[in-house]
């Protein structure tokens, strides 16, 4: 029978008696930075080339005895999870191992840096096909390790890393906190976050997705035919490295941004029990479990978007938070969220030639998050149209006036501290979907984009009575690009996108009381690209 | 692992060299910063990654490393250049006393310095 973890990542159409999806990553080389490995294990024999790279610290303790099988256990298991004959994800992938962790599983930031540099030099000397680098390790936050990962990613390498086993915010660890790296948390057979002793998988906004990481059967270094169960975010990362190898083998031209978007898109959604995470981290942690795409081709027609949360702004009055998209992505909308509800909105602004999403804290607020909606939109030309606060009682409005530009997102930002506390709701006039509407004291920002075949529509869901959460989703074939709340709802904490659903959160109803101002309306902007669909059909 | 940068492996306790002049002083208004791991038990004091500004060439990295060694030697400190980085980030890995950090941060081309720290299998 198929081990649970391979079954979990396999779409139903692949599920036969044996896990045998088409093309097992044969065009891709996966680099593993880990312990030494037992390369003659039957699971990985002939699939893993052990490089001569070794940079490890001495083992701790005078009584430590180097036992080959112990020294090799972590790396051998992970190599097996990525490409093992019986229990591997990408059975066709070839691997290269670098030793950066000693027999106790300990290494250094500097040794890891030198390892990453070794990979870059190898890539320059002998360019091959797509490269995936698996970093099944974690240390404290490191500016230099994150910077090195960024440079390697910008050289076209896909880096996949463990979120960490510290039951903590992954943003406090490296390389997990590097935005360019695909950071993977661990779930178990019940789709629960993995507990490891008193700790467990890391979580938070720096995690991209989760993957099987508990009770994973793989090659054991105890003997050349032995297997063992290991657990951790390393095992989860190895699954994603294998999935990435499969995807890149099918579509070698995929960029890192495209790969990440596809990993997110094909993940199982909303299956993780979020109660395991600390309350303040639940909204920030992606509820995604990695899976192989149902077919290796034909995903190109979709408009892919993901949600990127900023770091917390901090509580000072003028504090701001910034969320950024990856270099190859377009910022199509910007929203904000504050647990206290005290915020001064958000705006899209240019920074270093690229749009970013900035959220503003308000006096007495505990801080805000900026939430960017980052999408893959080839040949896009996007701009932000701003309307300053209006004098008219009908509120501020702005629309996309350029020919061929469509509205992909609305943001509003205000200087007054308690906007709209005693103001009646302002409703958008019907039949004008291409405009953003806001309070008269707010400046309104419309994200307007032109891209071949891009079409968008506005979808609203209003609830007259107070609700802690109001949602509106885009239908099949459409992708959520914008998420905001209709003005006039004074108790709104903010809005954010979860997969294809726009979520508007309000203060606890018990503290708000049911008033005429209790109405909450979630506004989603749903887009699709006919151009991408046509291009895909032409390819097929 | 054998270090490619063998020239810089030896411990240096040299007298003042011509490299140790005031030429190439750091640009005004740019202050290099020092970073270390927030988790104390994971810190590895005594080894530092000196990261140089983005466009720094390998020859400048080597010169900056030698300059640090010479200035440290003048003050009676032993230093050892463990590795010179190029290809991903310009910079070098140095084994030295933490007392020399202030001096190192003032070197030309230095962007920031990070104390080495541990990473662990997950």
């Amino acid at each position: 029978s198929i081990p649970w973890n391979l079954e979990r990542i396999t779409p139903p159409r692949y599920r036969a008696d044996e896990y045998q999806p088409p093309d097992g990553g044969s065009l891709v080389e996966v680099y593993l930075l880990d312990t030494s490995i037992q390369s003659d294990h039957r699971e990985i024999e002939g699939r893993v080339m052990v490089t001569d790279f070794e940079n490890v610290p001495e083992e701790d303790g005078t009584r430590f005895h180097r036992q080959a099988s112990k020294c090799d256990s972590h790396g051998t298991h992970l190599a097996g999870v990525v490409s093992g004959r019986d229990a591997g994800v990408a059975k066709g992938a070839s691997m290269r191992s670098l030793r950066v962790l000693n027999c106790q599983g300990k290494g250094t930031v500097s040794g890891t840096l030198i390892g990453l540099e070794f990979i870059r030099k190898s890539q320059l000397v002998q360019p091959v096909g797509p490269l995936v680098v698996l970093l099944p390790l974690a240390g404290g936050y490191s500016r230099v390790l994150n910077a090195a990962c960024q440079r390697l990613a910008r050289a076209g390498v896909v880096l996949v890393t463990a979120a960490g086993n510290f039951r903590d915010d992954a943003c406090l660890y490296s390389p997990a906190s590097a935005p360019e790296v695909i950071t993977v948390g661990a779930t178990n057979a019940q789709d629960q976050p993995v507990t490891l002793g008193t700790l467990g998988t890391n979580f938070g906004r720096c995690v991209d997705l989760f993957a099987p990481g508990e009770d994973i059967i793989g090659a054991s270094s105890d003997c050349s035919t032995c297997f063992v169960s290991q657990s951790g975010t390393s095992q989860a990362a190895a699954h994603v490295a294998g999935i990435a190898a499969m995807m890149l083998s099918a579509e070698p031209e995929l960029t890192l941004a495209e790969l990440r978007q596809r990993l997110i898109h094909f993940s199982a959604k909303d299956v993780i029990n979020e109660a395991w995470f600390p309350e303040d981290q639940r909204v920030l942690t992606p509820n995604l479990v990695a899976a192989l795409p149902p077919s290796t081709h034909g995903a190109g027609w979709q408009l892919f978007c993901r949600t990127v949360w900023s770091a917390h702004s901090g509580p000072t009055r003028m504090a701001t938070a910034v969320a950024r998209c990856a270099p190859d992505e377009e910022l199509l909308s910007c929203s904000s969220f504050s647990r206290s509800g005290k915020r001064r909105g958000e705006r899209m602004e240019a920074q270093g030639g690229k749009l970013v999403c900035r959220a503003h804290n308000a006096f007495g607020g505990e801080g805000v998050y900026a939430i960017a909606r980052c999408c893959l939109l080839p040949q896009a030309n996007c701009s932000v149209h701003t309307a300053p606060p209006a004098e008219a009682s009908m509120g501020t409005r702005v629309h996309c006036h350029q020919q061929g530009h469509v509205l992909t997102g609305c943001s509003s930002h205000w200087e007054v501290e308690d906007l709209g506390t005693h103001k009646p709701p302002v409703l958008r006039p019907r039949g004008q979907p291409n405009q953003c509407v806001g309070h008269r004291e707010a400046s309104i920002h419309a994200s307007c984009c032109h891209a071949p075949g891009l079409e968008c529509k506005v979808k609203e869901h209003g609830i007259p009575a107070p609700q802690e959460q109001v949602t509106v989703a885009c239908e099949e074939g459409w992708t959520l690009t914008g998420c905001s709340a209709l003005p006039g709802t004074s108790h709104v904490l903010g809005a954010y996108a979860v997969d294809n659903t726009c979520v508007v959160r309000s203060r606890d109803v018990s503290t708000t009381g049911s008033t005429s101002e209790g109405a909450v309306t979630a506004v989603a902007i749903c887009c699709r690209s006919r151009h991408l669909a046509q291009a895909s059909q032409e390819l097929q | 692992q054998e270090d490619e940068d063998g020239d810089y492996e030896e411990l240096v306790l040299a007298l003042r060299s011509e490299e140790d002049g005031l030429a190439e002083a750091p640009e005004h208004g740019t202050t290099a910063t020092f970073h270390r791991c927030a988790k104390d038990p994971w810190r590895l004091p005594g080894t530092y990654v000196v990261v140089l500004k983005e466009e720094t060439h390998l020859s400048q990295s080597e010169r900056t490393a030698r300059r640090l060694q010479a200035q440290a030697a003048r003050r009676g400190y032993l230093t050892k250049i463990l590795h010179v980085f190029h290809g991903l980030l310009p910079g070098f890995l140095v084994k030295m006393s933490g007392d020399l950090l202030e001096l190192a941060l003032k070197l030309p081309h230095v962007d920031y310095i990070e104390e080495d720290s541990s990473v662990f299998a997950q």
Epitope: P3, L196, Q230 | Q122
Partner: antibody, heavy 130, light 107 residues
């Protein structure tokens, strides 16, 4: 699905020997520690012995030390219990069971997390009587 | 060796009842305790591991708690299928010991 099937039980005289076998299916057999557990008629469960994946570590209950030997053959996906110098008090149903557990890394230490005996065979009866 | 003591030895209850079985260890075993259910002529079945984690496929009416030396197995609402013998097992080290068992019978 993993299945365990015991064999080799029977009637034996005190002082005699028996070799119990446990056949397993699937690669998961070789991935876990394995145990033998026995149950005397009308009594509770008693753990007898266990063995690591590669056979390099073995543990026994005091009452069988020096008399019983646990072993496994990875190639044959089989677990064995060689029982010598049998006594009347060894009369029981003998079960083989999979010790589901997993290894994981903490900050520089390799740890074992044990879930329990999650797969059991149907049992084989050993009767020691003259 | 660590001794495990279960109480009561026998427990009579009715369908729908909430029942609790206790297990005491002779020394601290942290949370390294499992609970099993056994029906006559059948092999035992794992219910709970690490004191409180529910094994996959086990109904949620079963729950475990405790750490150190005191542990409990609770069945929130007894079903006809739950009448059986229950065993606790410690695995603080690679050598294991079971409790003597608690027979749960119909009142």
């Amino acid at each position: 699905e993993v299945q365990l099937v015991e064999s080799g039980g029977g009637l034996v005289q005190p002082g005699g020997s028996l070799r119990l076998s446990c056949a397993a299916s699937g690669i998961t057999f070789s991935s876990y520690w394995m145990s033998w557990v026995r149950q005397a008629p009308g009594k509770g469960l008693e753990w007898v012995a266990n063995i690591k994946q590669d056979g390099s570590e073995k543990y026994y209950v005091d009452s069988v030390k020096g008399r019983f030997t646990i072993s496994r053959d990875i190639a044959k996906n089989s677990l064995y219990l060689q029982m010598n110098s049998l006594r009347a008090e060894d009369t029981a149903v003998y079960y083989c069971a999979r010790d589901r557990g997993t290894y994981y890394y903490g900050s520089g230490s390799y740890n074992y997390y044990y879930y329990g005996m999650d797969v059991w065979g149907q049992g084989t009866t050993v009767t020691v009587s003259s | 060796d660590i001794q495990m003591t279960q109480s009561p030895s026998t427990l009579s209850a009715s369908v729908g009842d909430r029942v609790t079985i206790t297990c005491r260890a002779s020394q601290s075993i942290s949370s390294w305790l499992a609970w099993y259910q056994q029906k006559p002529g059948k092999a035992p079945k794992l219910l709970i591991y690490k004191a409180s984690s529910l094994e996959s496929g086990v109904p949620s009416r079963f729950s475990g708690s405790g750490s150190g030396t005191e542990f409990t197995l609770t069945i929130s609402s007894l079903q006809p299928d739950d009448f059986a013998t229950y065993y606790c097992q410690q695995y603080n080290s690679y050598s294991y010991t079971f409790g003597q068992g608690t027979k749960l019978e119909i009142k």
